[in-house]
Structure formats: structure tokens, C-alpha cells
């Protein structure tokens, strides 16, 4: 899948964890979208 960024921000962003996609694992199905 594809995700485009730069159009809006996530106002509910957690303050303790980065909102970037976590490192891939073999269990990952939709890491960035």
C-alpha cells in the first residue's frame, strides 16, 4: 500500500511513541498505511 504525507497532521499523536512506522517484522502487514 501507499501513504502520502504532508497534507494533514495527526492531532492525536502520542507524546511517548514516535508516529513513524515501526521497524518491519515478518508479522507486519501494513506498516505504513
Amino acid at each position: 500500500s501507499e501513504t502520502t504525507t504532508g497534507t494533514s497532521s495527526n492531532s492525536s499523536q502520542s507524546t511517548s511513541n514516535s508516529g513513524l512506522a515501526p521497524n518491519p517484522t515478518n508479522a507486519t502487514t501494513k506498516a505504513a498505511g
Epitope: 497532521s9 508516529g19 521497524n23 507486519t28
Partner: antibody, heavy 118, light 107 residues
Framework: QVQLVQSGAEVKKPGASVKVSCKAS????????MGWVRQAPGQGLEWMGE????????TFNQKFKSRVTMTRDTSISTAYMELSRLRSDDTAVYYC???????????WGQGTTVTVSS | DIQLTQSPSFLSASVGDRVTITCRAS??????GAWYQQKPGKAPKLLIY???TLHSGIPSRFRGSGSGTEFTLTISSLQPEDFATYYC?????????FGQGTKLEIK
């Protein structure tokens, strides 16, 4: 040790496409996203997007979404970035960079100079 | 998108000096600020991530601090090899954004 080795310099005409490769070694290629960053002459750093090597999911900077294609070949631990419909202002050094979740862009390729000129 | 503003844009200093570069974000990026060093013709090199964590192999004279909207990079005693351009970056959300850079020159 982690190494990212990019393909060589390219000279392209306006309207053409360019494909840059980035071969990874020294770590599990599938365990980290691969990002792409460019730098125009004398300018700052501009993030273009990234690819998940396992799922091939991509996240793009909106500015490049319509012109950039990111792919990977896990069998040879290589990521690719293709930029189409080149313009003169696409003249830049293009970098691949491994992104670790907690650490950000922790290892970078040496850069590939792309010159767009008629 | 988040905007990152670095100050100063240019900085002249001497070997042995202590220098500080500031990065301000247009909204909170929690602790997720990073700093990179770039020398002419070379790729950027990660120095600091998550606000204050030193990347492996980076000398301890480099120190990062801050959270929320303001981050600082301090070099405690400048060495000749430290004269370069420094960029801040946010790694809290997409799109990943860099500051405009601070060029550190020899006085």
C-alpha cells in the same frame, strides 16, 4: 559494518526518468525501512519517502508522490528509487538512508548525483 | 507539515570554543529530534537521536537536549573536524522534516 552503496552519477534530459539503486550490506535488509533524501546544490535536505522492504508499503512526501517509484529486491538487498518527468530543479544528490524506528536515519549511502540538463 | 527553524544559520567559532545550535519546531515533536553533521561532498552523519541520545561512535563532546518544540545541540570543545553544516530533523511523524541547516565556520 552497515554499508549502503549507491549507483553512479547520472546525466538526464528534461522529461526523462532516472533510477537510483542502493545496495545494503552488514545488516538484515528486511528489518529496517529504507528512506530516500535529496539535496539540491547548496541547499538543505529534503525527505522524499521510504519503503518497507518486507511488505513494499511506501510512505511518500506529497511533493514527490506523482513522480517517484520506490521498489526493492530482497534477494539482493537492494532498494531502488525512480524519479520520472525530470526537470532542471531535480538536479541534486540523492541519498538512500536506513531508518531505524527509535534512531531515525542512522546510516546513509554515499549519494548519487543526478544532473538534469538539456 | 511541521516546520523546523534552526538558529543561527551561520556560526563562526574557534577551536576549543563551546557552541550551541537551536532548533525550534512549529508544534511539539515530543522527544523525537535528531541532529546530523554534513561535510562538503559527503553524506550526512547521525549524531544525536531522540533528543539527547548519542549515536554509536560519536564523541561525547556532542550533546543534545530538549523536547517538545525546542532542541539544542551543544559542542563542548570544538575540534578542527567539527567545522561542517549541522541539520536538525524531526522523527516524530510523517513527513520527516529537516531544518534549514547551520554552517559552522572557523573564525
Amino acid at each position: 559494518q552497515v554499508q549502503l552503496v549507491q549507483s553512479g552519477a547520472e546525466v538526464k534530459k528534461p522529461g526523462a526518468s532516472v533510477k537510483v539503486s542502493c545496495k545494503a550490506s552488514g545488516y538484515d535488509f528486511t528489518g529496517y525501512h529504507m528512506g530516500w533524501v535529496r539535496q539540491a546544490p547548496g541547499q538543505g535536505l529534503e525527505w522524499m519517502g521510504e519503503i518497507n522492504p518486507i511488505t513494499s508499503d511506501k510512505t511518500f512526501n506529497q511533493k514527490f508522490k506523482s513522480r517517484v517509484t520506490m521498489t526493492r529486491d530482497t534477494s539482493i538487498s537492494t532498494a531502488y528509487m525512480e524519479l520520472s518527468r525530470l526537470r532542471s530543479d531535480d538536479t541534486a544528490v540523492y541519498y538512500c538512508a536506513r531508518r531505524d524506528y527509535g534512531t531515525s536515519l542512522d546510516y546513509w549511502g554515499q549519494g548519487t548525483t543526478v544532473t538534469v540538463s538539456s | 507539515d511541521i516546520q523546523l527553524t534552526q538558529s543561527p544559520s551561520f556560526l563562526s567559532a574557534s577551536v576549543g570554543d563551546r557552541v550551541t545550535i537551536t532548533c525550534r519546531a512549529s508544534k511539539s515533536i515530543s522527544k523525537y529530534g535528531a541532529w546530523y553533521q554534513q561535510k562538503p561532498g559527503k553524506a550526512p552523519k547521525l549524531l544525536i537521536y531522540a533528543g539527547s541520545t548519542l549515536h554509536s561512535g560519536i564523541p561525547s563532546r556532542f550533546r543534545g537536549s530538549g523536547s517538545g518544540t525546542e532542541f539544542t545541540l551543544t559542542i563542548s570543545s570544538l575540534q578542527p573536524e567539527d567545522f561542517a553544516t549541522y541539520y536538525c530533523q524531526q522523527h516524530n511523524e510523517y513527513p520527516i522534516i529537516f531544518g534549514q541547516g547551520t554552517k559552522l565556520e572557523i573564525k
